[in-house]
């Protein structure tokens, strides 16, 4: 708290500008008129108003909005918008997405705050979902944004959302988040022609089921180990060895620097060896020539 | 953000010195910036300081002497220390943009005229 004191002759400020940042603290306090900050609070992120100073000023707008900042304040807090806390920003209702890409260009660069969390969500509630331009805004800002959100939140995503995505967009999604984002992207590209399809698919596919994969072995798709090695392993297990061999192309290959790994690992235990050794990969670990197989998850659902 | 002040010394009264201030990022090329100093046992102060417009201010105690520009091109802001004074003896800082707003400080350069 800056203490109230009177502001020396000839002190007063008449505007926002770069004299300002000689004033002591107590000078700006005393000094700015709160009104006129917030009207010329565009002028603010030109001046290089230090910490101590984003502080007085904060205050004094606090002052003047004790229920929270409307929008055309908060559109130009730029550095200011640094100095404030989630909750307050829970109090502010912002609409515009210029007011929400002018606060994220304030921590360009940076990790996600909790500021900039909290002020992500009370955006995307206010709109009820996350449509695209605040997808690609978002994304183009942090691009881990869609990998933070619980798959709860993920199903609001409309498909139509789903053309802004980038494969990097994906990068640090688990299972569970692609579970839901999948269906939605084919939906969304359901449209596209086969090889066109699985270039927009593909960062998607760790949350395909076996079904989808099975067709897409049909369609010459040459699918590369990195993509492979991300697909669910309840999904890979009921593969055969011919639809692998399909799906992967010319990548089969790499199976063998795999044989160790998820899903590969458990893949080849399911395979009988002899349908392994017609890939010429030397691939170890199969169910030898004569054993029978017995499904013991379908003999416990029948009995 | 890495604030990285350079080109101080020791300088007689009325000598010049050239300090220069580079960053990580482009934060010189888009922000207002300024340079500001702190002498032993005194606060730091603004000397002078750029809008992101490319205006100039000066403190009184500087106005006349001290020249601040930038090289957008570089990411680097420069003071140019003409006539000084005993009293200029301090160590300068740059700062601007997030940095400042985070109350993040590079290293400082030390200027002594004596």
């Known amino acids: 708290e800056v203490e109230k004191t009177a502001c020396p002759s000839g002190k007063k400020a008449r505007e926002i500008d770069e004299s300002l940042i000689f004033y002591k603290k107590w000078e700006l306090e005393a000094c700015v008129d709160a009104a006129l900050l917030a009207t010329q609070m565009d002028r603010v992120n030109a001046i290089p108003f230090t910490y101590e100073q984003l502080d007085v000023l904060k205050h004094k707008l606090d002052e003047l909005y004790p229920q929270g900042y409307p929008e055309s304040v908060i559109q130009h807090l730029g550095y200011l918008f640094l100095k404030m806390s989630p909750e307050d920003i829970r109090k502010w209702n912002v609409t515009s997405l210029e007011t929400l890409k002018a606060l994220l260009e304030v921590n360009k660069g940076h990790e996600m705050s909790p500021q900039v969390a909290t002020l992500i969500d009370r955006f995307v509630k206010g709109r009820g979902q996350l449509d695209k331009d605040t997808l690609d805004t978002l994304t183009a800002f942090y691009p881990g944004y869609l990998c933070s959100l619980s798959p709860e939140e993920l199903s609001s995503v409309p498909p139509s959302s789903i053309w802004a995505v980038r494969p990097q967009d994906l990068d640090t999604c688990d299972p569970r988040q692609l579970d839901v984002l999948y269906p939605k992207a084919r939906l969304a590209f359901q449209n596209m022609n086969g090889s066109e399809y699985f270039v927009k698919i593909q960062s998607f596919l760790g949350g395909a089921p076996t079904e989808d994969l099975k067709a897409l072995s049909q369609q010459n798709v040459s699918m590369d180990l990195a993509t492979f090695m991300k697909l669910r392993t309840d999904a890979v297990l009921p593969l055969t060895v011919a639809e692998v061999q399909k799906l992967l192309g010319p990548h089969v290959e790499g199976l063998k620097a795999e044989e160790r790994h998820r899903p590969v690992r458990d893949w080849i235990l399911r395979q009988r060896q002899d349908d392994l050794d017609t890939l010429g990969l030397g691939l170890q670990g199969g169910i030898p020539n004569g054993y029978l197989v017995l499904d013991l998850s379908m003999q416990e659902a029948l009995s | 953000v890495q604030l990285v002040e350079s080109g101080g010394g020791l300088v007689q009264p009325g000598g010049s010195l050239r300090l220069s201030c580079a960053a990580s990022g482009s934060m010189f090329s888009i922000n207002a910036v300024a340079w500001y100093r702190q002498a032993p046992g005194e606060q730091r102060e603004p000397v002078a300081a750029?809008?992101?417009?490319?205006?100039?201010i000066y403190a009184d105690s500087v106005k006349g002497r001290f020249t601040i520009s930038r090289d957008n091109a570089k990411n680097t802001v420069y003071l140019q220390m003409n006539s000084l004074k005993p009293g200029d003896t301090a160590v300068y800082y740059c700062n601007g943009g997030w940095s400042l707003a985070m109350d993040y400080w590079g290293q400082g350069t030390s200027v002594t005229v004596s």
């Open positions: 750029m809008t992101s417009g490319g205006s100039t």
